[in-house]
């Protein structure tokens, strides 16, 4: 069975075809939800509105964007906030209400045709029984704007580390790739002895942060080779 591969609590070496799977004890806990589950048509109304935790703008409704609720607040805790109307301050397109975009830090109308290449499309995530109806969870995303591209927050799906915000790297999680925190001093890291020698890592860790390297923990030198614990340590 694949139990040992997907058991996140252990680091195990497995026979082919899957190779070894690294556990993931060194990662920080994501503040925003990593999973969204669709409800059906019947569940599109909200009885009592609650702040909805998010990791990126596309997890919020059409009239919302994802940000920390307090200015300069903990960047780890983000919720869906009401979009900003015309002439309000902004930092990216998604902050502005539909029909507007962020230009020079201000939400302006996107009616002008010259903006077409950069305009945001409204994506409706349809979770009911008819994908052709706009009955679902609306999400906005910037199509081609390099200037206003928002980097992925922790838990966001990514293709490469440059897709992730500062302090995060793009690493494997289950069968996908998400932005995870770069490892801090003292956190467990994965040391690959030879390039290509490691097997499949279902839960990949990020690399150690700046000024740190992945080395055997000093008090683990006596342990057997296989159980040596590596941590991020100062050079």
């Amino acid at each position: 069975t694949l139990n040992s591969v997907l058991n996140s609590n252990a680091i195990k070496n497995l026979p082919p075809p899957l190779g070894g799977a690294a556990g993931h004890p060194g990662s920080a806990v994501s503040a925003a939800p990593g999973i969204l589950y669709p409800g059906g048509n019947k569940y599109q109304t909200i009885d009592n509105y609650q702040p909805y935790p998010c990791a990126e703008d596309e997890e919020c409704g059409t009239d919302e964007y994802c940000a920390s609720p307090t200015r300069g607040g903990d960047a780890g805790v983000q919720i869906c906030l009401a979009c900003r109307k015309r002439r309000k301050r902004c930092m990216r397109h998604a902050m502005c209400c539909p029909g507007n975009y962020c230009k020079n830090g201000i939400c302006v109308s996107s009616d002008q045709n010259h903006f077409r290449g950069e305009i945001e499309e409204t994506i409706t995530e349809s979770f009911g029984n008819d994908h052709s109806t706009l009955d679902g969870y609306s999400r906005r995303t910037t199509l081609s704007s390099k200037m206003y591209h928002t980097k992925g927050q922790e838990g966001s799906v990514c293709l490469r580390s440059s897709d992730c915000a500062s302090g995060l790297c793009c690493a494997r999680h289950f069968w996908s790739k998400i932005c995870k925190p770069v490892l801090k001093e003292g956190q467990v890291c994965t040391k690959h002895r030879r390039k290509g020698s490691h097997g499949l890592e279902i839960f990949q860790r990020c690399y150690c942060g700046e000024g740190l390297s992945c080395r055997i923990q000093k008090d683990h030198h006596q342990a057997s080779n296989s159980s040596r614990l590596h941590t991020c340590q100062r050079h």
Epitope: V5, S8, H24, P33, L36, I178, F203
Partner: antibody, heavy 114, light 112 residues
Framework: QVQLVESGGGVVQPGRSLRLSCAAS????????MHWVRQAPGKGLEWVAV????????YYADSVKGRFTISRDNAKNTLYLQMNSLRAEDTAVYYC???????WGQGTLVTVSS | DIVMTQTPLSLSVTPGQPASISCKSG???????????LYWYLQKPGQPPQFLIY???NRFSRVPDRFSGSGSGTDFTLRISRVEAEDVGIYYC?????????FGQGTQVEIK
């Protein structure tokens, strides 16, 4: 529109083959692991197969191992399930599913009958 | 495989009354990333799954707040505070911490 749309289902004789497709749109398909899950008439869901974001790693339920092959074309944002040596017990609605921020398609019915 | 056991298998509820469904997993669903990969979904005849709860207790943003999830480790509960006619169907729990994804047997909820 963020969605998954399955196609390719139909009626097929035992021992024959069928290829299902799942067209993804509205999200970064190439970053997500993708799964196939099926549901036999009147029964619960059964996980069938998974493929990693890059297509390099695949895993199958014991019931389909050696007969089914999962694959993906990230350039076309499409997931596939090649089903060979079909049996009556493979009759089910087949759903493709995105992991993490889970999203399911509407399903496509495969009926294996002589 | 992780066995998911649901109780009861059927439930008949008066509209406006509460309902509670239990789900037990054969092993802990707590991942080292701090998340517990347990979900609840509702299925109606001829329809795909409608997911209600993710990671034990998080409601999908458009799901009414009469639905709530709780639990940890291996014991989980889905509660509907006031059942409505539209809530009928089969409720399933599901885990995805480990392959294969596995599902509870389902709890049929009907209105009295």
């Amino acid at each position: 529109q963020v969605q998954l749309v399955e196609s390719g289902g139909g009626v097929v004789q035992p021992g024959r083959s069928l290829r299902l497709s799942c067209a993804a749109s509205g999200f970064t398909f190439s970053g997500y692991g993708m799964h196939w899950v099926r549901q036999a008439p009147g029964k619960g869901l059964e996980w069938v197969a998974v493929i990693s974001y890059d297509g390099n790693d695949k895993y199958y339920a014991d019931s389909v191992k050696g007969r089914f092959t999962i694959s993906r074309d990230n350039a076309k944002n499409t997931l596939y399930l090649q089903m060979n040596s079909l049996r009556a017990e493979d009759t089910a609605v087949y759903y493709c599913a995105r992991e993490l921020r889970v999203l399911w398609g509407q399903g496509t019915l495969v009926t294996v009958s002589s | 495989d992780i066995v998911m056991t649901q109780t009861p298998l059927s439930l008949s509820v008066t509209p406006g009354q509460p309902a509670s469904i239990s789900c037990k997993s054969g092993q802990s669903l707590l991942h080292s990333d701090g998340k517990t990969y347990l979900y609840w979904y509702l299925q109606k005849p001829g329809q795909p799954p409608q997911f209600l709860i993710y990671e034990v207790s998080n409601r999908f943003s458009r799901v009414p707040d009469r639905f709530s999830g709780s639990g940890s480790g291996t014991d989980f509960t889905l509660r509907i505070s006031r059942v409505e006619a539209e809530d009928v169907g089969i409720y399933y729990c599901m885990q995805s911490i480990q392959l294969p994804w596995t599902f509870g047997q389902g709890t049929q909820v009907e209105i009295k």
